[in-house]
């Protein structure tokens, strides 16, 4: 799999697109996971209902939340109020049984807010309150990583 | 009428290579993923991968991975199963059936093939 | 990988009878993904139930599945004649998809 990158602005919110065959996962429920580290294990964020007739339903976790639709195959996944500590390498996985197929492998960029010289007063930060349905969603800025680019930068 | 037919049977000699085939028809070939399933004389049945035709993503049983090569032609529906050098233990019946896509529960075989004997002796 | 237990390994009933099929398996499975097949000689398996207690399309209703966790049944409310064979519980839960050794219901 080729690591897709999605950058977003930080404050804001970023949607992240996963495309894939519905015929070949049918029945299948989706899940979104943080990969900790190269060889680490991807550590579950977010699934979908756990019916999957119902996958359509958004589900949430804290700030990140998770919609399918599974007749056009598309999982879209929602990180709300992005944060530095939400960049890193993520996966959109098919579940089946206790299996997990990789959907699509990601790379989460998050953008310095071009408006951060405001006082932190005039700063919008969605509150608990308020729903994913109101989030404003930027659109996100998606390439592939090229070839040679190392998706984990090797640690000194 | 939603059907998977096999090859006939085959008697080979070991050492020799064999590809048998699975052809479904009565619904979409490239929509369901496909298995294969062994069945040695007397014996029981033992899962040796799946193959999805929509883009011949293969599956192994680490039992028979590096033994046997699943594909498929989807453009004729047809899987196959082949062998590049027989041994007298492979003398069993082959199965072929689909996966159903009962949604929560994929993976039931519901469709079977009439299975295959494949006979290895010198 | 996961292994499936079934016993008895054979079980010898008169027509009319009820018969009692168990699987038990190593690991705890979702019980979306057991199947139990038939199948009888010279003939390929036939799925009879899906999803541990849901009959696939066709199935009479003598047959039922029920269990979960490990454990699992095949019940033949009153078997007929046609319903002496071996049956195999599978599960699809992990790979590599494994089947039961077998039950063999015999005429007695």
């Known amino acids: 799999h080729n690591t897709t990158v999605f950058q977003g602005v930080e404050g804001q919110s970023l949607q992240v697109s996963c495309p894939y065959d519905s015929m070949k996962h049918w029945g299948r429920r989706k899940a979104w996971c943080r990969q900790l580290g190269e060889k680490g294990p991807c550590q579950r964020v977010v699934s979908t209902h756990n019916l999957w007739l119902l996958s359509f339903l958004r589900r949430r976790n804290g700030s990140t939340a998770i919609t399918d639709d599974t007749l056009g195959g598309t999982l879209t996944i929602t990180l709300r109020n992005l944060q530095p500590h939400d960049a890193g390498f993520y996966q959109c996985q098919s579940l089946h049984g206790s299996e997990a197929d990789t959907l699509r492998k990601v790379l989460v960029e998050v953008l310095a807010d071009p408006l951060d010289h405001r006082d932190a007063g005039d700063l919008w930060v969605p509150g608990e309150s308020e729903s994913f349905e109101d989030a404003h969603v930027e659109h996100s800025i998606s390439r592939s990583l090229l070839e040679g680019e190392i998706p984990f930068p090797p640690t000194s | 009428e939603v059907q998977l037919v096999q090859s006939g049977a085959e008697v080979k000699k070991p050492g020799e290579s064999l590809k048998i085939s699975c052809k479904g028809s009565g619904y979409s070939f490239t929509s369901y993923w496909i298995g294969w399933v062994r069945q040695m004389p007397g014996k029981g049945l033992e899962w040796m991968g799946i193959i999805y035709p929509g883009d011949s993503d293969t599956r192994y049983s680490p039992s028979f991975q590096g033994q046997v090569t699943i594909s498929a032609d989807k453009s004729i529906s047809t899987a196959y199963l082949q062998w590049s050098t027989l041994k007298a233990s492979d003398t069993a019946i082959y199965y072929c059936a689909r996966h159903d896509i009962i949604p929560a529960a994929p993976g039931a075989f519901d469709i079977w093939g009439q299975g295959t004997m494949v006979t290895v002796s010198s | 990988e996961f292994v499936l237990t079934q016993s008895p390994g054979t079980l010898s009933l008169s027509p009319g009878e009820r018969a009692t099929l168990s699987c038990r398996a190593s690991q705890i499975i979702s019980s979306n993904y057991l199947a139990w097949y038939q199948q009888k000689p010279g003939q390929a398996p036939r799925l009879l139930i899906y999803?541990?207690?849901s009959r696939a399309t066709g199935i009479p209703d003598r047959f039922s599945g029920s269990g979960s966790g490990t454990d699992f049944t095949l019940t033949i409310s009153r078997l007929e004649p046609e319903d002496f064979a071996v049956y195999y519980c599978?599960?699809?839960?992990?790979?590599?998809?494994?089947f039961g050794r077998g039950t063999r219901l015999d005429i007695k």
């Open positions: 999803s541990a207690s």
């Open positions: 599978q599960q699809f839960d992990s790979s590599p998809i494994t």
